[in-house]
Interface confidence: low
């Protein structure tokens, strides 16, 4: 007998064809011989099957000798052998309905596990293969698991169920809830205003939750909460903020924080956490602040940086349009008795300048000027 695979929730059309190309009497029954539907003249009649108003046919095809059975909103329990009785013949079609669902929710936090569960009719032995949006293939039986979801796992997962040499394809949209960047670093000169942005890597109609920014200043022995806030339908409202520094927060997404000014005592690392309503776990984004200060004290010109810099970063002091006078993989460099002119302090990574601060050194009889 013919085997047809169907998807839970979908519509399937089982065909039944008579040799006579005209409307004649037909009946569709299930394996228990319970009538599903049939015709009486040009009328469609329905039997007492559990398919009820989910069963239909196409009357427009009857005149061509085609008497399909359409089953809407398929359920696993609809898996059965369906018999079409027409012209003293019986056509049997075995319908196997499969369902593939993601564990609890299709919106998962980064780092969580995704479990795909296959619902299948009794007696079937399907195999499943799924392909992630980044091309990773996983195979399994009734359940497939992927641990430690990453941002790249967001998108459409395509799963193929194979049974009786026939296949049915499922597409499941998975949204990995995460910030666009796991970590970011901001480089600022002392005194400049600092902007921190925390864009999300997903969009949902309603976003509700609460968040907090904890800050570990390089100079401090312990971390402290700089700001706590609520998120209601994408509207941000500040619950509590420290007095020093007094952060400002944007009222709309993306989450946006403004530090009034960069100071050495603020340099360090922060961790913004966002707890979303109805989700276990939190979203995290690390943010780092590096602050530069250039000073001249008597006969000493000093350039310093505070905050999390990598050991390969180079700190240099040079007179404008001249070679670097001093260049070190350290957090402070200085020049004794600097000659007059515009000096540049540069923080660079493999030749790329990340931060620059200029200081004008005047002849020894006057005081220095910081532009």
């Amino acid at each position: 007998k013919k085997v047809v695979l169907g998807k839970k929730g979908d519509t399937v059309e089982l065909t039944c064809t008579a040799s006579q190309k005209k409307s004649i009497q037909f009946h569709w029954k299930n394996s228990n011989q319970i009538k599903i539907l049939g015709n009486q003249g040009s009328f469609l009649t329905k039997g007492p099957s559990k398919l009820n108003d989910r069963a239909d046919s196409r009357r427009s095809l009857w005149d061509q000798g085609n008497f399909p059975l359409i089953i809407k909103n398929l359920k696993i329990e609809d898996s059965d052998t369906y018999i079409c009785e027409v012209e003293d013949q019986k056509e049997e079609v075995q319908l196997l309905v499969f369902g593939l669902t993601a564990n609890s929710d299709t919106h998962l936090l980064q780092g969580q596990s995704l479990t795909l569960t296959l619902e299948s009719p009794p007696g079937s032995s399907p195999s499943v293969q799924c392909r992630s949006p980044r091309g990773k293939n996983i195979q399994g039986g009734k359940t497939l698991s992927v641990s430690q979801l990453e941002l790249q796992d967001s998108g459409t997962w395509t799963c193929t169920v194979l049974q009786n040499q026939k296949k049915v394809e499922f597409k499941i949209d998975i949204v990995v809830l995460a910030f666009q960047k796991a970590s970011s670093i901001v480089y600022k000169k002392e005194g400049e205003q600092v902007e921190f942005s925390f864009p999300l890597a997903f969009t949902v109609e309603k976003l509700t939750g609460s968040g907090e920014l904890w800050w570990q200043a390089e100079r401090a022995s312990s971390s402290k909460s700089w700001i706590t806030f609520d998120l209601k339908n994408k509207e941000v409202s500040v619950k509590r903020v420290t007095q020093d520094p007094k952060l400002q927060m944007g009222k709309k997404l993306p989450l946006h924080l403004t530090l009034p000014q960069a100071l050495p005592q603020y340099a360090g690392s922060g961790n913004l956490t966002l707890a979303l309503e109805a989700k276990t776990g939190k979203l995290h984004q690390e943010v780092n602040l590096v602050v530069m200060r250039a000073t001249q004290l008597q006969k000493n010109l000093t350039c310093e940086v505070w905050g999390p810099t990598s050991p390969k970063l180079m700190l240099s002091l040079k007179l404008e349009n001249k070679e670097a006078k001093v260049s070190k993989r350290e957090k402070a460099v200085w020049v004794l008795n600097p000659e007059a002119g515009m000096w540049q302090c540069l923080l660079s990574d493999s030749g790329q300048v990340l931060l620059e601060s200029n200081i004008k050194v005047l002849p020894t009889w006057s005081t220095p000027v910081q532009p």
Epitope: N52, S57, R59
Partner: antibody
């Protein structure tokens, strides 16, 4: 908002036919089944049948099957119920109805009184 | 056809008291964990108004004084506390199988 507006009252002679209309608005007409329900004066409710406006597939109660035709016109968002070979016991109010989000009839027409009298 | 038998045929309840109407189906109307029974209120000259769907779900805009319960073949509609405005005829209806059928109705009078 969802509205079902039915045609006006009719007086018919026994043996004649009547065609009651039900104009839908406030939603996508082809997305929902339209049902027809009969209520004889002072009596209970009786389901006549239904139509899927998108496909034109209609199903009716065996009790009415030989005398009823349910149709729909997608261009005007209107469903029709025609009852033939009218008898005096067909005197009733005929309602069209539509399901809500659940399985019950959440939306109803105002009803059309059909009187069959010689 | 599934026959639905409502009882009582009529009842009179004092204002603020509880009204209980039962509906017995000729066969189970349960499927896949749901009970396909609905309840309606009808006042003279008006179409019926959906109160409860799938046995216990309150239709939007219906006060919580109305509640439905039951499964299989036995279902109940409760109104508590009864208000003057509740005087009407109440019908149960199964949406489990064609032909859809209604109970014969219960007339509620407020004392």
């Amino acid at each position: 908002q969802v509205q079902l507006v039915q045609s006006g009252a009719e007086v018919k002679k026994p043996g004649a036919s009547v065609k009651v209309s039900c104009k839908a608005s406030g939603y996508t007409f082809t997305d929902y089944v339209i049902h027809w329900v009969k209520q004889a004066t002072g009596q209970g409710l009786e389901w006549i049948g239904e139509i899927y406006p998108g496909s034109g597939s209609a199903y009716s109660n065996a009790k009415f099957k030989d005398r009823v035709t349910i149709t729909a016109d997608k261009s005007t968002n209107t469903a029709y119920m025609e009852l033939r070979s009218l008898r005096s016991d067909d005197t009733a109010v005929y309602f069209c109805a539509r399901r809500g989000n659940g399985t019950g009839f959440a939306y109803w027409g105002q009803g059309t009184l059909v009187t069959v009298s010689s | 056809d599934i026959v639905l038998t409502q009882s009582p045929a009529s009842l009179a309840v004092s204002l603020g008291q509880r009204a209980t109407i039962t509906c017995k189906a000729g066969q189970s109307v349960d499927y896949d964990g749901d009970s396909y029974m609905n309840w309606y209120q009808q006042k003279p000259g008006q179409p019926p108004k959906l109160l409860i769907y799938v046995a216990s779900n309150l239709e939007s805009g219906i006060p919580a004084r109305f509640s439905g319960s039951g499964s299989g073949t036995d279902f109940t509609l409760n109104i508590h506390p009864v208000e003057e405005n509740d005087a009407a005829t109440y019908y149960c209806q199964q949406s489990y199988k064609d032909p859809l059928t209604f109970g014969q109705g219960t007339k509620l009078e407020i004392k």
